[in-house]
């Protein structure tokens, strides 16, 4: 008897990251022997789209012509040959940008910052969230992302960095977004600079701890109360 | 592109009510707050309120507290501002707004609430 | 309240000049846990809704001009237009966003000499 049918490949064009109101294009490819691609989507009924394979079979596409929140999630997809489905893809987790306000991202106590010595990027959102992420430009993935375990949301995140080194230096962006969809994220704040000067090098970056801080009250929207050390938000390298 | 298209001008008697109507298109409602600004003829620029559409949470100015009231409708992405007990330092150009960060990057053209006997 | 109080109430500038409005507030704007000012700058023309030219004091809205430019720190802001053109003839309004009630100065209107 043979073996389970080869899982299909999944992916996202032009990326798995979409503004909102951008189109984008799922594909699954499979075998030539393929008759039918489903498409399934965490948390929704399947099958969340079926399609016909495009000549020579062995693929098929999935189109959302304007990205909206209701796209954002986990998907998988699956083939159908003569001989019965497949296994399912490796999930694909398509991210929707635009949902919320861009925060805004400081360095402190400035974008300039000697070697050796310690900076800390301070991401502040304009309504409370429970998750931020670090995303340093030309990284391949977010360099950090603080979640709250609790979900206690937050005005803000820290991001410190000791001791700096030329590793640190170039430019970020920050998002923020809500625990109940982490597939849907802010609009980046606007990018930040952080220039490293002198020559004490370490290759590794090595960030410390990270901070969260409530918001302040209603009469001082964005100068909060004093710091909260280690508030729920939990620091995953990515 | 992002819009925020008000209802039409409207003329209304002392004491009457009046509901002021702001639809947005061209990004994801829910997520942003829209605030709404006042601006009597030739004066200068008095914030309202704001309401933050994924809740419905509001703020209002002291100043307008218990005359105001702003609701939003998700289904339309649609929210109103409604200003009861109308006097005639009403009489104005009323906004909304969508906050970015406390300051606001899209307005809406206006509505002209007249209020006269 | 914060009071935001904008000099001068109305400005006259040759075309190709330097015009500066200013705008100063009754309390500082500058957060000490970002160092950022909450002051933004916004234009105004005749018959039209407000438009955002500058916020965090300094930073130019996307599609403006860079002959605009922020400056300032605290109490004290300016809004420089470096050389004026015939579509800069406009009210100018400051707007503090570091406490609410947020709040306008009220307004600068620039004219061409």
């Known amino acids: 008897q043979a073996g389970p049918l080869p899982k299909p490949t999944l992916w996202a064009e032009p990326g798995s990251v979409i503004s909102w109101g951008n189109s984008v294009t799922i594909w699954c490819q499979g075998t030539l022997e393929a008759r039918e691609y489903r498409l399934d989507k965490e948390e929704s009924p399947a099958p969340w789209d079926r399609q016909n394979p495009l000549e020579p079979k062995n693929k098929a596409r999935f189109s959302i012509p304007s990205m909206t929140e209701d796209y954002a999630g986990r998907y998988r997809c699956y083939y159908r040959s003569p001989v019965g489905w497949s296994q399912p893809s490796d999930p694909l987790e398509l991210v929707m940008t635009g949902a919320y306000s861009k925060p805004t991202l400081s360095a402190l106590p400035s974008p300039l910052v000697t070697s050796g010595k310690s900076v800390t990027l301070l991401c502040q959102s304009r309504s409370p969230m429970d998750t931020f992420l670090l995303i340093k430009e030309r990284a391949a993935h977010p360099l950090l992302h603080l979640r709250s375990e609790h979900g206690a949301q937050q005005h803000q995140a820290e991001f410190p960095m000791s001791p700096v080194t030329s590793v640190h230096g170039g430019t970020y962006r920050c998002f923020s977004s809500h625990g109940f969809s982490h597939y849907l994220l802010s609009h980046p704040s606007d990018p930040l600079e952080l220039i490293v000067s002198g020559s004490l090098e370490d290759p590794r970056p090595s960030p410390t701890r990270s901070v969260s801080t409530a918001a302040g009250p209603e009469d001082q929207p964005l100068m909060p109360t004093g710091s909260v050390p280690h508030s729920g938000l939990r620091r995953h390298w990515e | 592109q992002v819009q925020l298209v008000q209802s039409g001008a409207e003329v209304k008697k002392p004491g009457a009510s009046v509901k002021v109507s702001c639809k947005a298109s061209?990004?994801?409602?829910?997520?942003?707050?829209i605030d709404w600004v006042k601006q009597p003829p030739g004066k200068g620029l008095e914030w309202i309120g704001y309401?933050?559409?994924?809740?419905?949470?509001?703020s209002y100015n002291q100043k307008f507290k218990g005359r105001v009231t702003m609701t939003v409708d998700k289904s339309t992405s649609t929210v109103y501002m409604e200003l009861s007990s109308l006097r005639s330092e009403d009489t104005a150009v009323y906004y909304c707004?969508?906050?970015?960060?406390?300051?606001?990057?899209?307005w809406g053209q206006g509505t002209t609430v007249t209020v006269s006997s | 309240d914060i009071v935001m109080t904008q000099s001068p109430d109305s400005l006259a500038v040759s075309l190709g000049e330097r015009a500066t409005i200013n705008c100063k507030s009754s309390?500082?704007?500058?957060?000490?846990?970002?160092?950022?000012?909450?002051l933004a700058w916004y234009q105004q023309k005749p018959g039209q809704a407000p438009r955002l030219l500058i916020y965090?004091?300094?930073t130019r809205e996307s599609g403006v001009p860079d002959r605009f430019a922020g400056s300032g720190s605290g109490t004290d802001f300016t809004l420089t237009i470096s050389s004026l053109q015939a579509e800069d003839v406009a009210v100018y309004y400051c707007?503090?966003?570091?406490?609410?009630?947020?709040?306008f100065g009220q307004g600068t209107k620039l004219e061409i000499k």
């Open positions: 707004a969508r906050q970015a960060f406390y300051y606001f990057d899209y």
């Open positions: 061209g990004y994801s409602f829910s997520g942003f707050y």
């Open positions: 309401i933050f559409p994924s809740n419905g949470e509001t």
């Open positions: 309390q500082s704007l500058l957060s000490s846990s970002n160092q950022k000012n909450y």
């Open positions: 965090w004091a300094s």
């Open positions: 707007q503090q966003y570091y406490s609410y009630p947020l709040t």
